[in-house]
């Protein structure tokens, strides 16, 4: 059987606060638990939801949570069902409401000496106790002329007189808390001798030098007095006017007229009515001088045909608030249609090319008028004047590809080469009209080019193929001076390209034929075994039908390549001694020797007194110092080749002889002794 371990119990709860109805069950098998409220299943909400088997309330609601709750446990397999005891909330609450007139039925029926009953519509549970206030002052029960009925929440004034006039409010408190009336009641019982407002002055905005009129009227029995004051409390009468209100006139009916208004007249004007009895009534009105500021500038706008666009006109600051309207071609825009004004906005629906032009936003008030133009361009899709054409461009010369289009606004043109955007550099230049210039055409410029012309309305594109007309040229040009090693095999290459594959041949510059051991194999001059006689001037000639021939002159030198007779050795020298690094090279032409020390060439003219290079190439360093240590490279070179060899130099401190060592003891390492 299903057994309840914990059952829900009835309890006090506070409106809007948390609460929990507990329910715990024990059963032989699994059960599912649900809750009923007045017999209907409870649906989970964020406010009220099942928490395990219990029912949790995040905020108790006196309307939704009133009724009987019951916890039901069901074994869905067997169908067995058990129900808990019923539980309900005693919800404590208090809710504000207005003060209303209960008697008489309407305010119009309130007369002096009648009974007036007000009701305080604050409700709650438990029933709260009520406190009444007139003009913020508490009314205690039992005072003369009024009674308070807490049960009916009423305040009765009998009889009601002018002294009862005022703002009535109420507050109530209970165990739950406190609330005060959400809307208060103003009781106004006229005393004929009290001044009453008939006509109150209104704030006025006038343009400079215009006139302003304030109306003010009171009534009472006997008739009340009326007085006008300006800001500084100076009375204004037709007999005594303040210096800055010389043009003020007070009429018999109480109206005040100000003519030729100046900035110093702006401010607060007070109209004071005083009856035979009762307090003075002070009414205020402000005189403002009309003003209007300048309008901000519009940025030119570019729109596309067929779209809908809006341009907002921010009205300038001004008093009174300036009115705003749009004009086009001197005609005010309507408030509906295709091109119209909506609020402060200019609306262009389904834009046409003909809508382009200058639109003017006008703003005006009493102080004047301001205007600002906005230039609207209706963008069109570019059209072709001249598309790029498939072109043959000559190598080495400038080449041009046209992309001439027209549109509004002026279209922007970009070029692509093999689908890659061309950025302007020393080789490419895009002219203002869209033409692409290739400054010096190269063979690999032969490819596809595409130009795209765009405006905000859209873009067009076209492509053209460039074929480069190759010039007849050596690729690469042969070196004008070349060396061949004596008694060795040698080759001198010569190759060329052109629009047609050129034929290449070699000849001696003097026109004599090549010896039999020298062959010309498809442009490569081949020497089986170089002799001294092979030296001299040779010409490589490349030719084809359409482009003629080109020549390259080469001076061949026969040389014995450089070898070192003496190479510098690894050397260690005592500090302050002299180091000698020997180097001797041979070859034809006779090689020159240069030294490099510590990664810089040692210039013989700037060596200073400690260093010297001999004719035979040896390097001597006197009075060596530790900073002279390092690698020294001997470089031998002539007009045909260059060779180098290197050795390290170590500079060490001279050891102090120990007593055990004789004066003739050898040094601990190989030294140059000087």
């Amino acid at each position: 059987a299903i057994v309840f371990i914990k059952q829900p119990s009835s309890q006090d709860a506070l409106q809007g606060r948390r609460a929990l109805l507990r329910c715990e069950v024990e059963a032989p098998g699994p059960v599912h638990v649900y809750w009923l409220l007045d017999g209907a299943p409870v649906q989970d909400t964020e406010r009220r939801f099942a928490q395990g088997s219990s029912l949790s309330f995040a905020a108790v609601d006196r309307l939704q949570d009133s009724g009987t709750f019951q916890c039901v446990a069901r074994d869905d397999v067997t169908g067995e069902e058990a129900r808990s005891a019923n539980a309900s909330f005693n919800i404590k609450w208090i809710e504000a409401g207005p003060v209303v007139l209960k008697h008489p039925a309407s305010e119009a029926e309130i007369q002096p000496q009648t009974q007036v009953t007000l009701r305080c519509h604050i409700d709650g549970h438990p029933r709260p106790t009520y406190q009444w206030f007139r003009d913020g002052t508490p009314l205690s029960d039992g005072q003369s002329n009024h009674t308070v009925s807490s049960k009916e929440r009423n305040l009765t004034l009998r009889p009601a007189g002018p002294e009862h006039s005022g703002l009535y409010s109420c507050c109530a408190h209970s165990a739950f808390g406190q609330a005060c009336s959400s809307q208060n009641f103003t009781l106004s019982i006229a005393d004929e001798s009290f001044a009453r407002v008939v006509l109150a002055p209104q704030d006025v905005v006038v343009a400079r030098y215009e006139e302003a009129m304030f109306h003010c009227q009171f009534s009472a029995q006997p008739p009340p007095s009326l007085q006008w004051l300006f800001e500084d409390e100076t009375p204004i009468t037709n007999r005594s006017r303040p210096p800055h209100l010389r043009r003020a006139t007070v009429f018999a009916n109480g109206s005040l007229l100000l003519t030729q208004v100046r900035p110093r007249n702006a401010g607060i004007y007070r109209c004071i009515g005083q009856g035979q009895r009762g307090p003075p009534i002070i009414l205020e009105a402000t005189l403002h001088l009309a003003e209007i500021e300048d309008m901000p500038l519009f940025e030119p706008r570019v729109f596309t045909a067929g779209s809908e666009e809006r341009v907002t006109c921010l009205p300038p600051k001004g008093l009174p608030e300036p009115s705003v309207w749009w004009e086009h071609a001197g005609v005010r825009l309507p408030t509906h249609g295709r091109v119209y004004q909506k609020g402060h906005e200019l609306v262009l629906a389904n834009i046409a090319e003909s809508d382009a032009g200058v639109y003017t936003c006008h703003a005006a008030n009493l102080a004047g008028q301001r205007r600002q133009d906005v230039n609207i361009t209706v963008a069109t899709v570019p059209s072709w004047l001249k598309k790029p054409q498939d072109s043959q461009l000559e190598e080495g010369k400038p080449g041009y590809l046209d992309c001439l289009t027209q549109a509004t606004p002026k279209p922007t043109v970009v070029w692509y080469r093999n689908q890659m955007l061309i950025s302007e550099d020393s080789r490419f230049e895009v002219f203002k009209n869209g033409t692409l210039r290739i400054n010096s055409v190269e063979v690999y410029d032969g490819t596809w080019y595409r130009c795209m012309s765009s405006t905000p309305a859209g873009s067009i594109e076209a492509q053209a193929r460039v074929q480069v007309l190759e010039k007849l040229k050596f690729t690469p040009p042969p070196q004008p001076q070349q060396c061949m090693e004596f008694d060795k095999e040698a080759t001198v290459p010569c190759s060329a390209t052109g629009r047609e594959k050129p034929t290449i041949k070699w000849e001696r510059a003097d026109g004599s034929s090549l010896p039999e051991w020298v062959t010309d194999n498809a442009g490569t001059l081949h020497f089986a075994r170089v002799t001294r006689d092979d030296a001299g001037n040779y010409t490589c000639i490349a030719s084809n039908g359409p482009q003629g021939q080109i020549r390259a002159h080469v001076q061949l030198t026969v040389a014995v390549f450089i070898t070192f007779k003496v190479e510098p050795e690894r050397t260690t020298v005592y500090q302050g001694h002299t180091a000698l690094l020997q180097c001797e090279a041979q070859g034809d032409p006779k090689p020159l020797i240069q030294w490099k020390g510590k990664d810089r060439i040692l210039d013989p003219t700037k060596l200073g007194p400690r260093m010297h290079i001999f004719q035979n190439g040896s390097l001597v360093i006197h009075d060596v110092a530790p900073e002279d240590s390092g690698r020294y490279t001997c470089i031998a070179g002539n007009s045909c080749n260059i060779k180098h060899t290197e050795a390290p130099l170590y500079v060490v401190d001279k050891p102090v002889p120990e007593e055990s060592e004789g004066p003739g003891s050898p040094p601990p390492y190989k030294m140059i002794q000087t």
Epitope: G39, P41, D44
Partner: antibody, heavy 112, light 110 residues
Framework: EVQLVESGGGLVQPGGSLRLSCTAS????????MNWVRQAPGKGLEWVGI???????YYASWAKGRFTISRDTSKNTVYLQMNSLRAEDTAVYFC??????WGQGTLVTVSS | EIVMTQSPSTLSASVGDRVIITCQSS????????LAWYQQKPGKAPKLLIY???NLASGVPSRFSGSGSGAEFTLTISSLQPDDFATYYC??????????FGQGTKLTVL
């Protein structure tokens, strides 16, 4: 022995009414829930409604208005009152206690 | 209106096969677990297999198992036996004492 026996099925004309009974033995209806489920020929199971231990009833949306579940605890019997019957109400009607205990079913045929 | 969708509607399998039937509800079941599976053979009343999503009813072989939560559930038969060829139904319970069945899955011999 705990068991359920349905009765009251038979042939009824369209627009007619029929009351099915489900007599329980071996347990009390006052602390159990009872379901009615139907199955049209060759079709799937369709839940009709439930009566809980307190006698409150709940129905499938299609059954509301035409079908009424009630009980008589003194006779330990649950009823299914069916009004304004249509051809598509032809089915075997089962009563079931919870999920486990089912009756053998009774056939209702609605035909002219 | 609550809709429970079983898939597949029909399923052919062989003895020894592992079979999975899914049941999807248009809204979450009560407590995310109030779901049962039934087996029905022609001319018989349905027989309870699984209750509260994954609990095995008494006398039901352990090759039957259930899983899932909220609105998606599965019935698994780990190794199909000759006696298992039948029609299977899922049934969900919902807030407000409302119940609904799936349209059924007919399991036949391949």
């Amino acid at each position: 022995e705990v068991q359920l026996v349905e009765s009251g099925g038979g042939l009824v004309q369209p627009g007619g009414s029929l009351r099915l009974s489900c007599t329980a033995s071996g347990f009390s209806l006052s602390n159990h829930v009872m379901n009615w489920v139907r199955q049209a020929p060759g079709k799937g199971l369709e839940w009709v409604g439930i009566i809980d231990s307190s006698g409150s009833t709940y129905y499938a949306s299609w059954a509301k208005g035409r079908f009424t579940i009630s009980r008589d605890t003194s006779k330990n019997t649950v009823y299914l009152q069916m009004n304004s019957l249509r051809a598509e109400d032809t089915a075997v009607y089962f009563c079931a206690r919870g999920l486990y205990l089912w009756g053998q079913g009774t056939l209702v045929t609605v035909s002219s | 209106e609550i809709v429970m969708t079983q898939s597949p509607s029909t399923l052919s399998a062989s003895v020894g096969d592992r079979v999975i039937i899914t049941c999807q509800s248009s809204q979450s079941v009560y407590n995310n677990n109030l779901l049962a599976w039934y087996q029905q053979k022609p001319g018989k009343a349905p027989k309870l297999l699984i209750y509260y999503t994954s609990n095995l009813a008494s006398g039901v072989p352990s090759r039957f198992s259930g899983s899932g939560s909220g609105a998606e559930f599965t019935l698994t038969i780990s190794s199909l036996q000759p006696d298992d060829f039948a029609t299977y139904y899922c049934q969900g319970g919902y807030n407000g004492n409302i119940y609904a069945f799936g349209q059924g899955t007919k399991l036949t011999v391949l």
